[in-house]
């Protein structure tokens, strides 16, 4: 029968006894940064062109014996899970392998480095179709790689890493927390986070999605027809890339942000149970493991967005967060959190030339995150009007003026330590959707977007009695661009988006009496385009 | 993810050293910047990616590169560049003594640099 | 059911050509190895090769190297046997048989074609 | 190639009465990774296709009685019939699949005596 992971990756429309998705990936090209490989395994060979390039350490140990078979071990695993006809994801993607890893599995930053550069210089000289670059390895936070990996992503290609192998915060390692690369964590057949040894997958904001990665079966370099199981970040890294080799294939002008958002929209939500992780890593890790679009075209029509979190401001009284988007992508609402509650709320700003998301903490607080709702919409023209603090006993209001612009998100921000001793606002006033209303001592900010077909609206969800979390979710069709608490007393402690559903989080309400101050309302902005589903039926 | 500039949890040296008459000032008075893996095993001290300014071109990382190697000579330090990097982004991989990083992190062009350390399989 | 079946039985001259089938159905045929196993009379089980029928990748013992040609149409689940000039000693009973996932050993084997080869 | 080796040729046993059927191979058919040997028992009766009866050197195929057991690693193995019965009667073939070309035991010829 089907391994485990394949299965996993299928949507259930594919499901038989058989893997055999749509498309293999042949307009695509995978290259993988790895171990030598054993390029004659019946599961690659004709597959895999292994290229002339090597820069690799010494092996430590004076006695360390140099066995072709443990050379080739790991990378010869990845290119068949990636690709292999027996057990690969992408059964028709053709492979390149430069080899970065010694026979111990250890390698440079300078030697990974000069690889990426051959891959640069290898699609200059002769442009080929979507190239996918996998990077099935970790080290420690690298300035440098990371830059590199950002020049090769804007320069057109995909980059697919490791989240690491660490049970840590992926962001303290490189190339898993460069922005621009899909970083991949691994779950197990129970869609549980891997545990390997001591440690296990690595976890955090910098991971983009989980990816089946314990018990994986592949071609393993003992012998030409032999296979093996192996577990880890690597494993779940070479079923992404796999997956974005097929849908590159499918549709080979994706950008890398129309990737990425695809990845995410088509991932299975929320079946990862999250008590693995620390406690402070469970709202900022995404529950998402990776799965194969149901059908390679037809989704184009939707609007994509993802929630993308900052590094955390640290405690200093006028610490900042600020969370920013992908070069493709709008920034179309901006959100907050504190886990002490002590915060200042946030604010969209220009910098350079465009939108970022800034969160503001507040005396005594042990820091924010400033939180960004980022979505694909193309020919969009996007604007923040702001209102000062109204000081009226009506709160703060701001609106949408331009004509045929809509409200996609709602920031508040304010100087004053504490919005709870003082009056909370009153609800806006209904059939006024275009319309942020906030505290009268904050100064409000609504994202303003035009975009060809964009229609949105405003949907609430208010709890009279406290509770330390509310939600309020976009139908089927609607896509959620703003998230954001009425009112911003002291008690709340942030707002943020969850795939399709908006979350405020309170105090513990154990430690708030039950008052009118108690009551907490979560309000979402829905938004569609009818542009965007149009042109995908004039397409179909 | 992480800022391409956010210096997370990773030791950030702007290290000035006295007056070279033999190193031109970085241009606009900006300082360089050392970069090293957080976590110590992995380091590879006596090896460093010396990355310059964005546009800087081939021939001038070479210049920079041999600048150095000729700035450190006189100083009895033998160098020798590993790699000249161009197409992802300028600079040049140098084996040499970290007591010559003041020195380079003056050279013109340079944004910063950075020990190697190791990376490994997951 | 998981099955294959094989063309019929063939009588030819030395020096002819021959082409014989092997027809996979209840399963996908893109995604299983197909090998060929000769049989000569009162003899052992000889492995020929193999093809995996999702990109024709072949794979031939040395001894059937250049003698056989292996293929495979993936859009009629159908692989192939081809000898371009017979001789006498091609005589024999010729298999084709499934490959168990990911292992070349084989749960399912086709009936079987004899091919007599005389003048 | 790995070749195969097969003893005995033929073998006469009583019905009910155990028997032993040994492979051997050239090289090592046993791999560190996965701590597996790749070997297979095929059994082919007369007028019929070969059929799959152990893989792995001991794992059943499913629907092989088990009276069928399979044994050994590295280069020497057995496969055993404890208690033959009239259906068992046909030639049996070890078949290493570890390496491309994949190659079989000359066969035994099991018959009762």
């Known amino acids: 029968s089907i391994p485990w992971n394949l299965e996993r990756i299928t949507p259930p429309r594919y499901r038989a006894d058989e893997y055999q998705p749509p498309d293999g990936g042949s307009l695509v090209e995978v290259y993988l940064l790895d171990t030598s490989i054993q390029s004659d395994h019946r599961e690659i060979e004709g597959r895999v062109m292994v290229t002339d390039f090597e820069n690799v350490p010494e092996e430590d140990g004076t006695r360390f014996h140099r066995q072709a078979s443990k050379c080739d071990s790991h990378g010869t695993h990845l290119a068949g899970v990636v690709s292999g006809r027996d057990a690969g994801v992408a059964k028709g993607a053709s492979m390149r392998s430069l080899r970065v890893l010694n026979c111990q599995g250890k390698g440079t930053v300078s030697g990974t480095l000069i690889g990426l550069e051959f891959i640069r210089k290898s699609q200059l000289v002769q442009p080929v179709g979507p190239l996918v670059v996998l990077l099935p390895l970790a080290g420690g936070y690298s300035r440098v790689l990371n830059a590199a990996c950002q020049r090769l992503a804007r320069a057109g290609v995909v980059l697919v890493t490791a989240a690491g192998n660490f049970r840590d915060d992926a962001c303290l390692y490189s190339p898993a927390s460069a922005p621009e690369v899909i970083t991949v964590g691994a779950t197990n057949a129970q869609d549980q986070p891997v545990t390997l040894g001591t440690l296990g997958t690595n976890f955090g904001r910098c991971v983009d999605l989980f990816a089946p990665g314990e018990d994986i079966i592949g071609a393993s370099s003992d012998c030409s027809t032999c296979f093996v199981s192996q577990s880890g970040t690597s494993q779940a890294a070479a079923h992404v890339a796999g997956i974005a080799a097929m849908m590159l294939s499918a549709e080979p002008e994706l950008t890398l942000a129309e990737l990425r958002q695809r990845l995410i929209h088509f991932s299975a939500k929320d079946v990862i149970n999250e008590a693995w992780f620390p406690e402070d890593q469970r709202v900022l890790t995404p529950n998402l493991v990776a799965a194969l679009p149901p059908s390679t075209h037809g989704a184009g029509w939707q609007l994509f967005c993802r929630t993308v979190w900052s590094a955390h401001s640290g405690p200093t009284r006028m610490a900042t967060a600020v969370a920013r988007c992908a070069p493709d992508e709008e920034l179309l609402s901006c959100s907050s959190f504190s886990r002490s509650g002590k915060r200042r709320g946030e604010r969209m700003e220009a910098q350079g030339g465009k939108l970022v998301c800034r969160a503001h903490n507040a005396f005594g607080g042990e820091g924010v995150y400033a939180i960004a709702r980022c979505c694909l919409l193309p020919q969009a023209n996007c604007s923040v009007h702001t209102a000062p603090p109204a000081e009226a006993s009506m709160g703060t209001r701001v609106h949408c003026h331009q004509q045929g612009h809509v409200l996609t998100g709602c920031s508040s921000h304010w100087e004053v330590e504490d919005l709870g001793t003082h009056k909370p606002p009153v609800l806006r006033p209904r059939g006024q959707p275009n319309q942020c209303v906030g505290h009268r001592e904050a100064s409000i900010h609504a994202s303003c977007c035009h975009a060809p077909g964009l229609e949105c609206k405003v949907k609430e969800h208010g709890i009279p009695a406290p509770q330390e979390q509310v939600t309020v979710a976009c139908e089927e069709g609607w896509t959620l661009t703003g998230c954001s608490a009425l009112p911003g007393t002291s008690h709340v402690l942030g707002a943020y988006a969850v795939d399709n559903t908006c979350v405020v989080r309170s105090r513990d309400v154990s430690t708030t009496g039950s008052t009118s101050e108690g009551a907490v309302t979560a309000v979402a902005i829905c938004c569609r385009s009818r542009h965007l589903a149009q042109a995908s039926q004039e397409l179909q | 993810q992480e800022d391409e500039d956010g210096d997370y949890e990773e030791l950030v040296l702007a290290l000035r050293s006295e007056e070279d008459g033999l190193a031109e000032a970085p241009e606009h008075g900006t300082t360089a910047t050392f970069h090293r893996c957080a976590k110590d095993p992995w380091r590879l001290p006596g090896t460093y990616v010396v990355v310059l300014k964005e546009e800087t071109h081939l021939s001038q990382s070479e210049r920079t590169a041999r600048r150095l190697q000729a700035q450190a000579a006189r100083r009895g330090y033998l160098t020798k560049i590993l790699h000249v990097f161009h197409g992802l982004l300028p600079g040049f991989l140098v084996k040499m003594s970290g007591d010559l990083l003041e020195l380079a992190l003056k050279l013109p062009h340079v944004d910063y640099i950075e020990e190697d350390s190791s990376v490994f399989a997951q | 059911q998981v099955q294959l079946v094989q063309s019929g039985a063939e009588v030819k001259k030395p020096g002819e050509s021959l082409k014989i089938s092997c027809k996979g159905s209840?399963?996908?045929?893109?995604?299983?190895?197909i090998s060929w196993v000769r049989q000569m009379p009162g003899k052992g089980l000889e492995w020929m090769g193999i093809i995996y029928p999702g990109d024709s990748y072949t794979n031939y013992s040395p001894s059937f190297q250049g003698q056989v040609t292996i293929s495979a149409d993936k859009s009629i689940s159908t692989a192939y046997l081809q000898w371009s000039s017979l001789k006498a000693s091609d005589t024999a009973m010729y298999y084709c048989?499934?490959?168990?996932?990911?292992?070349?050993?084989?749960?399912?084997w086709g009936q079987g074609t004899l091919v007599t080869v005389s003048s | 190639d790995i070749v195969m080796t097969q003893s005995p040729d033929s073998l006469a046993v009583s019905l009910g009465e155990r028997a032993t059927i040994n492979c051997r191979s050239s090289?090592?058919?046993?791999?560190?990774?996965?701590?597996?040997?790749?070997l297979a028992w095929y059994q082919q009766k007369p007028g019929q296709p070969p059929k799959l009866l152990i893989y792995w050197a001991s794992t059943r195929e499913s629907g092989v009685p088990d009276r069928f057991s399979g044994s050994g690693s590295g280069t020497d193995f057995t496969l055993t019939i404890s208690s033959l019965q009239a259906e068992d009667v046909a030639v049996y073939y070890c078949?290493?699949?570890?390496?491309?070309?994949?190659?079989f035991g000359q066969g035994t010829k099991v018959e009762i005596k």
């Open positions: 078949q290493q699949y570890s390496s491309f070309p994949i190659t």
């Open positions: 209840g399963y996908s045929f893109t995604n299983y190895w």
């Open positions: 090289q090592s058919v046993l791999y560190s990774s996965n701590n597996k040997n790749y």
């Open positions: 048989a499934r490959d168990y996932f990911y292992k070349p050993l084989f749960d399912i």
